[in-house]
Interface confidence: medium
């Protein structure tokens, strides 16, 4: 949560002198409450923007938006608060508009914008207006609160933002899930243009229950350039576990823009209509790590096999 | 070589909560999961639950839910088991395990004694 | 909850004699059943999994086999140091569960 680094930041307009300042989120009209304060905002809009940074990056920022009033209390407003809070983090950030001249009425209800304030994909805000001077301890309350949830990376907007795109946001892997039997499924995906590993981890599921009843890690190691923009598959083999029916392979890369925070794409098999029980393995891959030697993968909790391809 | 070093032995008194340690090296932690299975004087194995190290996933033994909570910390190769509110009945060795459903190594165990 | 029960609860045996350990299980486990060797003030020890293969550092005298609902852990030649209580426990179903062990003592 920072501000847009290098906008002048403006909220002057035709009939009012206005300076934009940092805020410590604790105005001086809480210390020193006034006789008289002014109503709260009417209306607070917010809606996502994308700005550029004067590094040229593209960055997420909250578009804020609120109108007046039309009461006299107007010819008490000194300026406003402007608060973001990240909910996940408590973590705030404040500006202070700061009003060089007195308000008039006109024509027009007063309307006031401010889209600095640079946020993170998949996060949730309050922002919050809070007219100045603040009210005496008993007044009533002068400010006005909305939430916005910032949309992921998925999003159409957010995928060509920096933020997304340092995370791996432009890679689709495409994952496709089949089961072959009772014991296999088989995971497609495509391959990044980077020489990088991917981990699959494999989370099973009993039907419409949450908690998992199986885990198994595999690991692809890096492909090589001739491989970049392939399918690759692999094929994972599922515990023999009563009811363990329903699969979620989750994909995760290790770009190295984002190392071990990339973006994870997922894809679910639901449980059979009907589940007939399983039959029993016959043959299985040793719960061991190779004794020696090394393996290309290590599985984490299960004796399932599993192998994988490039295609071309 | 694969270890798993648990916290040393605890006494408690009964309602109160403890919270037992168990520091794995000599393998990727995120690679495997961590069980945990406890024994009571004289007596038998009883499994409760299973955390996984790569998702934080948990499956608790129906008896404890609702007073047990597992966690990790992955920046120092740790999982915790704490029980509250505890009972005389929850005397026992606790032991962590490695891996989900067959356990492949074992920490030395910790005595938890609840006593008033 | 699958109940695992082992037989006997006590074994005694000569060294060098052959032990034959049970555990039955309440409902078809398939091939989801290890076994641990355990010594007073000491963790489980893991012996055989998935019913029938050694665990790594293992000595061949002991073996598992069995399916289903019956299984057996057998020690061919019993040492001074095989001496213990040796559990059985399924992994087909959750909650994974322990049979009451069996005390293998010197006869």
């Known amino acids: 949560l920072r501000l847009l680094d290098h906008r002048a930041l403006v909220c002057s307009q035709p009939g009012l002198n206005c300076t934009v300042k940092n805020s410590t989120c604790l105005d001086d009209s809480w210390i020193h409450p006034r006789n008289l304060t002014p109503s709260s905002p009417k209306n607070i809009y917010i809606n996502l923007s994308v700005s550029s940074t004067q590094h040229g990056e593209l960055v997420p920022v909250l578009h804020v938006e609120w109108t007046l009033q039309t009461d006299a209390s107007i010819l008490y407003l000194e300026g406003a608060e402007l608060s973001v809070l990240q909910l996940n983090t408590n973590e705030r950030l404040c500006v202070r508009f700061e009003f060089l001249s007195k308000l008039r009425h006109h024509h027009r209800r007063w309307r006031f914008t401010f889209s600095h304030f640079v946020v993170d994909p998949d996060q949730e805000y309050e922002v919050t207006v809070h007219h100045l001077p603040k009210p005496i301890p008993d007044g009533d309350p002068n400010h006005q609160s909305k939430n916005f949830l910032v949309p992921d990376c998925e999003h159409a907007r957010m995928k060509v933002t920096t933020p997304c795109m340092s995370s791996g946001s432009l890679w689709d892997p495409n994952i496709t899930v089949e089961t072959l039997d009772t014991q296999h499924l088989r995971v497609d995906f495509t391959l990044w243009n980077e020489s990088t590993h991917y981990q699959i981890l494999l989370t099973s599921f009993p039907h419409m229950e949450n908690h998992s009843c199986f885990e198994h890690m595999h690991h692809i190691p890096a492909p090589r350039p001739e491989e970049f923009h392939q399918r690759s598959n692999v094929t994972l083999t599922l515990r023999n576990l009563k009811g363990c029916c329903r699969h979620q392979v989750q994909i995760q890369p290790f770009f190295s823009s984002c190392l071990n925070d990339c973006l994870r794409h997922s894809a679910t098999v639901s449980c059979p209509e009907m589940p007939d029980t399983p039959e029993p393995i016959p043959d299985y891959m040793p719960l061991w790590e190779p004794r020696s030697g090394s393996s290309d993968y290590k599985d984490d909790d299960d004796k399932g096999s599993s192998h994988h391809h490039h295609h071309h | 070589q694969v270890q798993l070093v648990q916290s040393g032995a605890e006494v408690k008194k009964p309602g109160a909560s403890v919270k037992v340690s168990c520091k794995a090296s000599g393998y990727t932690f995120t690679r495997y999961g961590i069980s945990w299975v406890r024994q009571a004087p004289g007596q038998g194995l009883e499994w409760m639950g299973w955390?996984?190290?790569?998702?934080?996933?948990?499956n608790y033994a129906q008896k404890l839910q609702g007073r047990v909570t597992m966690t990790t910390d992955t920046s120092t190769s740790t999982a915790y088991m704490e029980l509250r509110s505890l009972r005389s009945d929850d005397t026992a060795v606790y032991y962590c395990?490695?891996?989900?459903?067959?356990?492949?190594?074992w920490g030395q165990g910790t005595l938890v004694t609840v006593s008033s | 909850e699958i109940v695992m029960t082992q037989s006997p609860a006590t074994l005694s045996v000569s060294p060098g004699e052959r032990a034959t350990l049970s555990c039955r299980a309440s409902?078809?486990?398939?091939?989801?059943l290890a076994w641990f060797q355990q010594k007073p003030g000491q963790a489980p020890r893991p012996l055989i999994y998935?019913?029938?293969t050694r665990a790594t550092g293992v000595p061949a005298r002991f073996s598992g086999s069995g399916s289903g609902t019956d299984f057996t852990l057998t020690i061919s030649s019993l040492q001074s140091e095989d001496f213990a209580v040796y559990y059985c426990?399924?992994?087909?179903?959750?909650?994974?569960?322990f049979g009451g062990g069996t005390k293998v003592e010197i006869k």
């Open positions: 955390i996984s190290t790569y998702s934080g996933n948990t």
């Open positions: 409902q078809s486990v398939s091939s989801n």
């Open positions: 426990q399924q992994y087909d179903n959750w909650p994974l569960t």
């Open positions: 998935d019913a029938s």
């Open positions: 395990a490695r891996r989900q459903l067959y356990f492949d190594y």
